[in-house]
Interface confidence: low
């Protein structure tokens, strides 16, 4: 016979020959790695056909690593369904926890037993520095020095030493977030005050009063006989400025070729009615929409 | 106020059984791990059990196993540990503590007395 | 006896540093598991002071650390003050079982 034959899990015992007589017998033991389970044989003789009598590496097991158990707070994914030699385990923390530690460990052999690559991580919880301290503000629980996973805090404006108040630019609420980080930047406190918008041939419809602060929101619409051009919506920014710009209402043409431009507001125009009596935040009917009432 | 409230202990005879509680307030309790630890008179600390987050996992001191189960409601924010077949060397301030690698809340702890 | 080994006592005048030792072994410490301080005043429950090694949750002073080298870790405590007066407690984990070692009582002379 010519040489025995070659198996994944098993190997010849003794150094191979090229030729081996009829009746010789040959002898197997599993690799590395691997543990025999009897009762099927392990070794083979050749016959006298030239050929070697049936054996298999069927008798031997992989190696498995310890089983390892979910993290407290974790779980632990084996990647390819066993806990054999060349498995990996892939571990996650649940919500509000880190990982301290690999975060794969894979299954290898070290000398003939299969041991993990390392020990399993650790999760434990995230937490956060406290947030950032602000001019002209403060936010809830500042004594507090360490703030657990979507811990939150809300900053709120101080008051403002002169006629206008402090306005909170940003996120007025953020939260302990993950990698131990808050979820928004600090937001910022500082006066936000707009020019009273003016729009000749036009007339306010809503957003009425003397002073515009941060997030005002003032609508227009045109007089009788003239268009707007831009946005009748305006918003009052962080900058102080409106934005979209200060809308003009233009005259529309009477040319019998053109067509007349229309208003960029969708659906019917409200007419504009002055407050019959004299609401807060509505200017009085003797002063009138289109004075400029900023200060 | 972030705190654990214990309950439950007390003078109970060797092989009777006795129930502990504590109650969380503050926080929910179903996102952590939750132990028990005890602590005889004038010895050290001795973990006892712990109970994973979901209520699957626990794990138990090979002293108690057998003997004590912990358990949890999250609906109520609550930790179980129930005490069977005492013994007068289970005699000790039971504490119950939140944490998972360790333990960053502790109740105030209640004492159990095992005696005939 | 405990796994986790703590000397029983030790002592120091107001302001000196003192450190408190703990020995393990290669199944818990030595085997990469993160080493706990706990102190215990008289007649309260314990608090943890030192997490993951030589982690600080808040409201502890700087004046307490720890360290880990091996199969041992350390806590010292600097500019040692009277109300540091106390029982400490190291622990640690290996294979789903939490570990305490015996205590240590803390004398501020």
């Known amino acids: 016979c010519e040489a025995p034959p070659t198996f994944e899990a098993m190997e010849l015992i003794g150094k191979p020959k090229p030729y081996y007589r009829v009746g010789e017998r040959v002898d197997y033991k599993c690799k590395k790695g691997y543990f025999y389970i009897p009762p099927l044989a392990t070794h083979t003789i050749c016959d006298r056909n030239h050929t070697w009598l049936p054996v298999s590496d069927e008798g031997c097991y992989r190696e498995m690593c310890p089983h390892i158990r979910d993290p407290l707070n974790g779980e632990a994914i084996l990647a390819n369904g066993s806990y054999e030699f060349g498995a990996e385990l892939h571990f996650i923390c649940n919500e509000g926890y880190y990982l301290i530690g690999k975060d794969i460990l894979y299954c290898e052999l070290k000398d003939t037993v299969a041991i993990w690559s390392g020990k399993p991580p650790l999760c434990e919880k995230i937490l956060c520095t406290p947030p950032p301290k602000i001019k002209n503000g403060k936010h809830t629980f500042s004594e507090v020095e360490v703030f657990e996973y979507l811990d939150a805090v809300t900053y709120s404006c101080d008051p403002a030493p002169g006629p206008d108040p402090f306005s909170l630019i940003g996120e007025s609420m953020i939260y302990c977030g993950n990698n131990s980080t808050w979820s928004h930047a600090a937001p910022e406190c500082k006066v936000v005050k707009c020019r009273f918008p003016v729009v000749e041939n036009g007339k306010q419809i809503s957003g009425f009063g003397k002073k515009f602060y941060y997030k005002a929101t003032v609508m227009f619409e045109c007089d009788k006989g003239y268009y707007l051009n831009g946005s009748d919506k305006i918003v009052c920014e962080s900058n102080s400025t409106w934005d979209p710009p200060v809308p003009k209402c233009l005259k529309v043409s009477t040319s019998p070729t053109t067509k007349s431009p229309t208003s960029s507001a969708s659906g019917p125009r409200p007419t504009y009615k002055p407050p019959v009596s004299n609401y807060p935040g509505y200017p009085k009917p003797d002063e009138g929409i289109l004075n400029n009432l900023d200060d | 106020q972030v705190q654990l409230v214990q309950s439950g202990g007390g003078v109970v005879q060797p092989g009777r059984s006795l129930r502990l509680a504590c109650a969380a307030s503050?926080?929910?309790?179903?996102?952590?791990?939750m132990h028990w630890v005890r602590q005889a008179p004038g010895k050290g600390l001795e973990w006892v059990a712990v109970?994973?987050?979901?209520?699957?996992?626990?794990y138990y001191a090979d002293s108690v196993k057998g003997r004590f189960t912990i358990s949890r409601d999250n609906s109520k924010n609550t930790l179980y540990l129930q005490m069977n077949s005492l013994r007068a060397e289970d005699t000790a301030v039971y504490y119950c503590?939140?944490?998972?690698?360790?333990?960053?809340?502790w109740g105030r702890g209640t004492l159990v007395t095992v005696s005939s | 006896q405990s796994v986790l080994t703590q000397p029983p006592s030790v002592s120091g005048a107001p302001g000196q540093r003192v450190t408190i030792s703990c020995t393990g072994s290669?199944?818990?410490?030595?085997?990469?598991?993160?080493v706990h301080w706990y102190q215990q005043l008289p007649g309260t429950a314990p608090k943890l002071l030192i997490y993951?090694?030589?982690n600080r949750p808040s409201g502890v002073p700087d004046r307490f650390s720890g360290s880990k080298s091996g199969t041992s870790a350390s806590l010292a405590i600097t500019g040692l003050q009277a109300e540091d007066e106390a029982d400490y407690y190291c622990?640690?984990?290996?294979?789903?079982?939490?570990?305490f070692g015996g205590g240590t009582k803390l004398t501020v002379l």
């Open positions: 503590a939140k944490g998972g690698g360790y333990f960053d809340l």
């Open positions: 503050g926080l929910t309790v179903n996102n952590y791990a």
């Open positions: 109970i994973s987050y979901d209520g699957n996992n626990k």
């Open positions: 290669s199944s818990n410490i030595g085997a990469g598991y993160d």
């Open positions: 993951g090694n030589n």
């Open positions: 622990s640690s984990y290996t294979s789903g079982t939490w570990l």
